[in-house]
Amino acid sequence: FERTRSLQDPCSNCPAGTFCDNNRNQICSPCPPNSFSSAGGQRTCDICRQCKGVFRTRKECSSTSNAECDCTPGFHCLGAGCSMCEQDCKQGQELTKKGCKDCCFGTFNDQKRGICRPWTNCSLDGKSVLVNGTKERDVVCGPSPADLSPGASSVTPPAPAREPGHSPQ
């Protein structure tokens, strides 16, 4: 099939990094500057991605592969292939329509991205707050209040004595 195809279509012989130039009797011409073709048999070369502004070049464009971008310091990638750059905030903040804002009381964010999330409600699990939450950290839940009541012990009580007259099974 490949042989048949190449007889029918001279463009199939053009390797990656070139294009089949219709203006020159379908001769394989190199991709012009700032363009690429990643597969053979292409009739045009694709324009290289440009990393501008908050985007910076992670990998230069070559005749056979597109450029790859990431984000400048202070920003992080969003989307497939880093299609967007989003500004970082500090821990304890979230990005709002007014820029980076501190988390409201009762919420926290332990990362430079994402939104502030509510502190864990320890009482829902029957536990008490061992360490208070902050803007940057969630609360730490500890033992249930009943476990901390006076006289309560975390030591396992001894097993009850066997009744007399019963031999072990």
């Epitope: 990393c51 502004g53 908050v54 985007f55 971008c69 969003l78 299609s83 967007m84 989003e86 990005l95």
Partner: nanobody
């Protein structure tokens, strides 16, 4: 070809004012949301302000009340009026399109100017 050309930067004393301009061409400016970002010497980029095509504006907290973003669709121009300037406002200021409409977020297809340097110093 899309072009964004900033102008109006320069040296100004603390407390002084400057007006930055951005001349846009090669795209439908009137229907495009636009933004200003800045990069202080040796630091990362920071979103400063954005304006919708409708004229609705947003500002980073540190410039609110001191900077005013505006646009003149008839002249295909974006502006940033800066007053009560501080040393920490020293940066290269960039004009950019703003396709995401999300504060502090830019898309790979956004266009950027070459920047204009603002230096606040006595």
């Amino acid at each position: 070809e899309v072009q964004l050309v900033e102008s109006g930067g320069g040296l100004v004393q603390p407390g002084g004012s400057l007006r930055l301009s951005c001349a846009a061409s090669g795209f439908t400016f009137s229907s495009s949301a636009m933004s200003w970002a800045r990069q202080a010497p040796g630091k990362g980029f920071e979103w400063v302000s954005s304006i919708y095509s409708s004229g609705k504006t947003y500002y980073v907290e540190s410039v609110k009340g001191r900077f005013t973003i505006s646009r003149d669709n008839a002249k295909n121009s974006l502006y940033l009026q800066m007053s009560s300037l501080r040393a920490e406002d020293t940066a290269v200021y960039y004009c950019a399109t703003w396709k995401t409409l999300r504060v502090g977020v830019w898309d790979e297809s956004d266009y950027w100017g070459q920047g204009t340097l603002v230096t606040v110093s006595s």
